[in-house]
Interface confidence: low
Amino acid sequence: DAHKSEVAHRFKDLGEENFKALVLIAFAQYLQQCPFEDHVKLVNEVTEFAKTCVADESAENCDKSLHTLFGDKLCTVATLRETYGEMADCCAKQEPERNECFLQHKDDNPNLPRLVRPEVDVMCTAFHDNEETFLKKYLYEIARRHPYFYAPELLFFAKRYKAAFTECCQAADKAACLLPKLDELRDEGKASSAKQRLKCASLQKFGERAFKAWAVARLSQRFPKAEFAEVSKLVTDLTKVHTECCHGDLLECADDRADLAKYICENQDSISSKLKECCEKPLLEKSHCIAEVENDEMPADLPSLAADFVESKDVCKNYAEAKDVFLGMFLYEYARRHPDYSVVLLLRLAKTYETTLEKCCAAADPHECYAKVFDEFKPLVEEPQNLIKQNCELFEQLGEYKFQNALLVRYTKKVPQVSTPTLVEVSRNLGKVGSKCCKHPEAKRMPCAEDYLSVVLNQLCVLHEKTPVSDRVTKCCTESLVNRRPCFSALEVDETYVPKEFNAETFTFHADICTLSEKERQIKKQTALVELVKHKPKATKEQLKAVMDDFAAFVEKCCKADDKETCFAEEGKKLVAASQAALGL
């Protein structure tokens, strides 16, 4: 349905408030270093222009594409060359190359200051003084730090952010009311950003087919009563939504997501019995709720898969007629029967099935050739099961912090070339799999753990891609999306690594560590642990544990001392000397 003016169409569909918010997000995700005020000015100019197009769709420039309009606006920024360097060269290109160029310059790790949370009273005053600016600032700060954040979902976060301040700024104890809500939003926001980053990586690095396969598996687990044709329709629509958002087409994405939520709710009888509550909510809550909805119950008496996919004499005929449809049906049928499997495992099984059919359908006796294909699945299923069992046992034995430390050591030995901040961030997140998933019963552990690990390893992949330092990381990240986790699991100690020179400065600490939060103090200690392993990759667990225990005791002792700084200086020298002796540095 072509519209004379795309910008007028989206403005009318989304409404002024959502239109302005989405344009702000889009601009902040592209120009991550620009000041807030500059972005607000650009957004206001675009909004005024959109209103003229709503009044008269034939007005000058109203027929231009959104990429053209937004790109032209971004290219008016005076300091583009000074602030962004070669990104300014994008402005010399025509659409669609210009937008592709902007996309390629999105920075997953922008050099921006850490967001420091002001005092509660200061935040409440700012909220009351100018609520609109306060909320726009939130959108801007999140969007520029997370350039792939799922824009319609960020609107939902902003709505909850506003609700938290509206409620808590009138409470008797503002801090007790507000701070836990802000912590929850921060943690959920980071998780949401990372999940969306994997979707975009899947689309951009491995193509639409890979994303669709993921979506078939996930939606079939979630909606096992839905027919294959229904799941296929949802997958097609969902792929369009995420392709748009990952491509910077945020207005189209938000509009299409709303349409998809509407369709799902109008057809919930043929999709899932779990959607009723979601569908009674307002739009933003509804879309979020649908995305998180629990798996529906599996239909009773589903027949054995073997009949259609192994025993049937028509397997090769059906496969040859429409390969992707047949494989899609296999994935749908397998996934709806296995909510206990991770999506990546289901995709590995589908890949094994595809490889077998490719080989066997060209053989003299195809049926005999693929007759045992399901036997090949068993080891693929057992590998993640065993890995999760072992790691959950380790987590229960050690607790989260020490489990993170075990992973820090493991991953630093595998890929010691990776930067220390990246190793700390990724290993801390890998370690969170314990508290997130090990509490679940067996039937929910694998989908929780392995699909979460896929998200975290994607963080490693996108951070490493910006500054590649390890061929092993590049290989695990690029060769197969679904085998990333097994690939990293299989990496042994990197024997080619030349240990880092010892630098006492790395292990020099000051009294400021005493005022840090527990989390920040852990990060300091974990940073030191990574550096230790980089200096002495052959150090044993026992040696590292002894040094870390000494380090913890040193910090505790000096933080209790009267003259903290002197204690850190003198005791620190002793600790470094003792550590060097213990590790043979």
């Epitope: 590998e383 290989k475 097994p486």
Partner: nanobody
Framework: QVQLVESGGGLVQPGGSLRLSCSAS????????MGWYRQAPGKQRELVAS???????HYADTVKGRFTISRDNSKNTLYLQMNSLEPEDTAVYYC?????????WGQGTQVTVSS
């Protein structure tokens, strides 16, 4: 690219034993599955035993209790210890290694069980 070379096959009497080896070279990191398959004359290739990266093993029902799969990471070698061999075990035995780069097969080694 991964190169696989099997050895240890031969002629053995029923009830006898053999130990197959599969030596891997090339880009062998990132392995997540290693297995032994066999193909008897006029039949399709079938899985005999497999071992995952964490050391868990899986055996075909016909060889359970008689065959043992193992690996030596330091030598990049996969083994199949075959005891109480039966004439039905006669086949060409192939070693298979899967890593992130793909699925790799050896050329096969002939095992003949006959009196």
């Amino acid at each position: 690219q991964v190169q696989l070379v099997e050895s240890g096959g031969g002629l053995v009497q029923p009830g006898g034993s053999l130990r197959l080896s599969c030596s891997a070279s090339g880009s062998i990191w990132g392995i997540y599955h290693m297995g032994w398959y066999r193909q008897a004359p006029g039949k399709q290739r079938e899985l005999v035993a497999s071992i995952t990266v964490d050391g868990s093993t899986h055996y075909a029902d016909t060889v359970k209790g008689r065959f043992t799969i193992s690996r030596d990471n330091s030598k990049n070698t996969l083994y199949l210890q075959m005891n109480s061999l039966e004439p039905e075990d006669t086949a060409v035995y192939y070693c298979d290694i899967r890593n992130v780069g793909g699925d790799y097969w050896g050329q096969g080694t002939q095992v003949t069980v006959s009196s």
